[in-house]
């Protein structure tokens, strides 16, 4: 079988707009080094959110300046996208990668769909 | 417009070396996974290598393995073939190409009009 | 490594034609399978990614289906630019082979 990758179908950003989701993999090979992306569909434009390459056993390192975090725990990557806001409300696409050793393989989920809802503004208190 | 030229073929003979150029413009370059892809002349297409954005992980069809070498440089939108130890079953046209589609993963979106290396005695 | 085949090698077909052509991978490679159009002299062209994703560009007459280890390419009627060779391709893992080919030519 081809490299399977899971993800939840649904998820619903917190009110501080921060969602997290499992992408799962089935591996076809003993990886060493993984590449994790997340990709958002939406309107069929596809864009990248954010990437980490990360050794296995070792903690997943995103750029200072991602909306990303995450870990990793075997086959099994545990990913939190923050400042969400109801604009940002689209399907989430997990594309993971072997990178290391060869030979190189490639699975994409099938999309977890974050809602993100502004919350209501806090009336004027005198 | 996007586009991709490539540069540095030839004549040479079996035993000798080449490098081959493909010049990136119309796109951020530094941002894209590349690819070199050959054809022999009357036949069907063969992938050489790739080398991803950072140009950290590469890859190579085993014909080529220990004798090629991708390289790139992204200061100058570059993609690079070094070719050595050439042999007669290497003589064939070399396309670089581009993976650009996020959700096809090594899809090749945009090549190159290809450069004609042969090798002969 | 992943072995692609292609059926048939080459097919003889008129304007206005329904041609279809197969391509068969060795081991499952799920839906990450492209076409692409190659006509002599020239750089290939992707028409198909991702088993059934139609190429900005490409004209709707072609389509693509298919996924694990057979896929299938339809062109719905043959028009005359696209009398050409056409490759499948796997880009699920390294090497990324290619099929042998199947040219389409003018009966």
């Known amino acids: 079988k081809a490299m399977h990758v899971a993800q939840p179908a649904v998820v619903l950003a917190n009110s501080r707009g921060t969602a997290s989701f499992v992408c799962e993999y089935a591996s076809p090979g003993k990886a060493t080094e993984v590449r994790v992306t997340v990709l958002r569909q939406a309107d069929s434009q596809v864009t990248e959110v954010c990437a980490a390459t990360y050794m296995m056993g070792n903690e997943l390192t995103f750029l200072d300046d991602s909306i990303c975090t995450g870990t990793s725990s075997g086959n099994q990557v545990n990913l939190t996208i923050q400042g969400l806001r109801a604009m940002d409300t689209g399907l989430y696409i997990c594309k993971v990668e072997l990178m290391y050793p060869p030979p190189y393989y490639m699975g994409i989920g099938n999309g977890t769909q974050i809602y993100v809802i502004d919350p209501e503004p806090c009336p004027d208190s005198d | 417009q996007v586009q991709l030229v490539e540069s540095g073929g030839g004549v040479v003979q079996p035993g000798r070396s080449l490098r081959l150029s493909c010049a990136a413009s119309g796109f951020t370059f530094s941002s894209y996974v590349m690819h070199w892809v050959r054809q022999a002349p009357g036949k069907g297409l063969e992938w050489v290598a790739v080398?991803?954005?950072?140009?950290?992980?590469?890859y190579y069809t085993d014909s080529v393995k220990g004798r090629f070498t991708i390289s790139r440089d992204n200061s100058k939108n570059t993609l690079y073939l070094q070719m050595s130890s050439l042999r007669a079953e290497d003589t064939a046209v070399y396309y670089c190409?581009?993976?650009?589609?996020?959700?096809?993963?090594?899809?090749?979106?945009?090549w190159g009009q290809g450069t004609m290396v042969t090798v002969s005695s | 490594d992943i072995q692609m085949t292609q059926s048939p090698s080459s097919l003889s077909a008129s304007v206005g034609d329904r041609v279809t052509i197969t391509c068969r991978a060795s081991?499952?490679?799920?839906?990450?399978l492209n076409w692409y159009q190659q006509k002599p002299g020239k750089a290939p062209k992707l028409l198909i990614y991702a088993a059934s994703s139609l190429q900005s560009g490409v004209p709707s007459r072609f389509s693509g289906s298919g996924s694990g280890t057979d896929f299938t390419l339809t062109i719905s009627s043959l028009q005359p630019e696209d009398f050409a060779t056409y490759y499948c391709q796997q880009s699920y893992s390294t090497p990324f082979t290619f099929g042998p080919g199947t040219k389409v030519d003018i009966k």
């Open positions: 081991q499952s490679i799920s839906s990450y």
């Open positions: 080398i991803w954005s950072d140009g950290r992980n590469k």
């Open positions: 190409a581009r993976s650009g589609i996020a959700l096809a993963g090594n899809a090749f979106d945009i």
